[in-house]
């Protein structure tokens, strides 16, 4: 997977009046990395691993960037003409990626009340607008404003692309993101299903990077995909991921089943607990 930096900013309006402040989150390699603390008006790292990325450096630069972006987005929202009464939101998501072959991608997406209405490839400067008439109207509105704004020139988009990549490279240089391997905690639970059956669930949590194999085995042989149910691999808010896999088995056959986990070149197998209450949890 490519390395990525993703900025997610949201500004709000009430009855046509743009609210002060903004919401901002930054994700590094899909993990919550920074958020803007509105009380302290500062960018704050999300968890210890995020702090480790910058070491003892301050977060002034990040604070400055997010504040500037928030101000720009508030101005953009103020120029959206179709604001009716009530609460409305304008969200900007900007993503840049560095792929294994060192190629890069950058894009920017605008959402009004949660609906995508404008996207731009920051490298080619191509704009894309969804087909709906509402999206077309909003996109024209915002593009006209962006053209009027002297800051939003050709060089500005190049700068947005370059700045995002520069920040991403700076974070990667710390080595924390690249080197980091956090092994999963694996636990197996059982619950009653239909008569004569139980559902066994294997959960892996607090692991990094995201790639993991988690599967049920019967007598040491992997069960087919159609007999297992998988959860998505999701961030758990601590700079790590979590996922699960479940299957239904006959009561009394528990000893035949194990959960197999493989992560970052390591593996483990985990039996089904024999009692109803017992949960086997292990950190390999």
């Amino acid at each position: 997977e490519p390395h990525s930096l993703r900025y997610n900013l949201t500004v709000l309006s009430w009855d046509g009046s743009v609210q002060s402040g903004f919401l901002a989150e930054v994700h590094l390699d899909g993990q919550p990395f920074l958020r803007y603390d509105r009380q302290k008006c500062r960018a704050k790292p999300q968890g210890q691993w995020a702090e480790d990325v910058l070491g003892n450096k301050t977060w002034d630069r990040e604070t400055r960037d997010l504040t500037g972006n928030g101000k720009d987005l508030r101005m953009t929202l103020a120029h959206i003409k179709d604001q009716k009464e009530g609460l409305h939101s304008l969200q900007e998501i900007r993503v840049c990626e560095i792929h294994e072959d060192n190629s890069t991608r950058s894009s920017q997406h605008f959402y009004y009340d949660g609906e995508l209405f404008l996207s731009q490839n920051l490298e080619t400067e191509e704009w894309t607008v969804p087909q709906s008439s509402r999206a077309q109207t909003l996109a024209m509105n915002v593009r006209n404003f962006l053209k009027e704004d002297a800051m939003k020139t050709k060089t500005h988009y190049h700068a947005m692309h370059a700045d995002c990549l520069q920040e991403l490279r700076r974070y990667l240089e710390s080595g924390v993101v690249l080197r980091r391997t956090v092994p999963p905690m694996v636990n197996v639970t059982r619950s009653e299903a239909s008569e004569g059956n139980i559902t066994v669930t294997c959960r892996a949590s607090s692991f990094y990077p995201r790639n993991i194999i988690l599967t049920w085995r019967q007598d040491g042989v992997s069960l087919s995909h159609d007999t297992q149910q998988w959860g998505d691999v999701l961030p758990d808010g601590n700079g790590t991921y979590q996922t699960w896999v479940a299957t239904r088995i006959c009561r009394g056959e528990e000893q035949r089943f194990t959960c197999y986990m493989e992560h970052s070149g390591n593996h483990s197998t985990h039996p089904v607990p024999s009692g109803k209450v017992l949960v086997l949890q292990s950190h390999w």
């Epitope: 085995r217 007598d219 040491g220 042989v221 992997s222 000893q255 035949r256 194990t258 197999y260 593996h267 483990s268 197998t269 985990h270 039996p271």
Partner: antibody
Framework: QVQLVQSGAEVKKPGASVKVSCKAS????????FYWVRQAPGQGLEWIGY????????VYNQKFKGKATLTVDKSTSTAYMELRSLRSDDTAVYYC???????????WGQGTLVTVSS | DIQMTQSPSSLSASVGDRVTITCRAS??????LNWYQQTPGKAVKLLIY???RLHSGVPSRFSGSGSGTDYTLTISSLQPEDIATYFC?????????FGQGTKLEIK
């Protein structure tokens, strides 16, 4: 490639015990189960039991409970099967086998002949 | 225990012949059936798993079919190196049980 090398032939007296070894190479030892099977002279194959080498969990054929004990030594990538209270009808070739997680008994050892005779 | 009845117990065929060996289970084994080849002085080899899946490196002249209680191993064109004993294994229900074997000879 996956290789299972078993210990040499054994001759034992009735009532004695024997420990057959199965040394694995060519893959990560704790990844896959070990299965044990026997074939008495002129007879078919009989499954004895299996062991998960990661945590040592075992499942036995009821017929061999109390007769066979399966263990592993992770440090030497070796699986063991101990047979106790040997009788003449335990005379057989004993095989270890492992899997690739797609099928049971994917790879087999060459077999170990255990002869029980007074 | 599930009984696996394999037939024939021995058979003689010529090079190039199509050879069929069958295994019948005493109850439904849901396709959890493997076929193996045992040659004197060599390790046992897996040929087919889950009724019809060819194990890697096994020649395509070997194939498997069946469902429920009845399963078949077919060698489409017998080769001299196929002379061996063949047996089936059911892996659906514990204890795992094997067929008695079919000894294949060249005419």
């Amino acid at each position: 490639q996956v290789q299972l090398v078993q210990s040499g032939a054994e001759v034992k007296k009735p009532g004695a015990s024997v420990k057959v070894s199965c040394k694995a190479s060519g893959y990560a030892f704790t990844k896959y189960n070990f299965y044990w099977v026997r074939q008495a002279p002129g007879q078919g194959l009989e499954w004895i039991g299996y062991i998960d080498p990661y945590f040592g969990g075992t499942v036995y054929n009821q017929k061999f409970k109390g007769k066979a004990t399966l263990t592993v030594d992770k440090s030497t990538s070796t699986a063991y099967m101990e047979l106790r209270s040997l009788r003449s009808d335990d005379t057989a070739v004993y095989y270890c086998a492992t899997t690739d997680a797609y099928s049971l008994f994917t790879y087999w050892g060459q077999g170990t002949l255990v002869t029980v005779s007074s | 225990d599930i009984q696996m009845t394999q037939s024939p117990s021995s058979l003689s065929a010529s090079v190039g012949d199509r050879v069929t060996i069958t295994c019948r289970a005493s109850q439904d084994i849901s396709n959890y059936l493997n076929w193996y080849q045992q040659t004197p002085g060599k390790a046992v080899k897996l040929l087919i798993y889950y009724t019809s899946r060819l194990h890697s490196g096994v020649p395509s002249r070997f194939s498997g079919s069946g469902s429920g209680t009845d399963y078949t191993l077919t060698i489409s064109s017998l080769q001299p190196e196929d002379i061996a004993t063949y047996f089936c294994l059911q892996g659906n229900t514990l204890p795992f049980t094997f067929g008695q074997g079919t000894k294949l000879e060249i005419k």
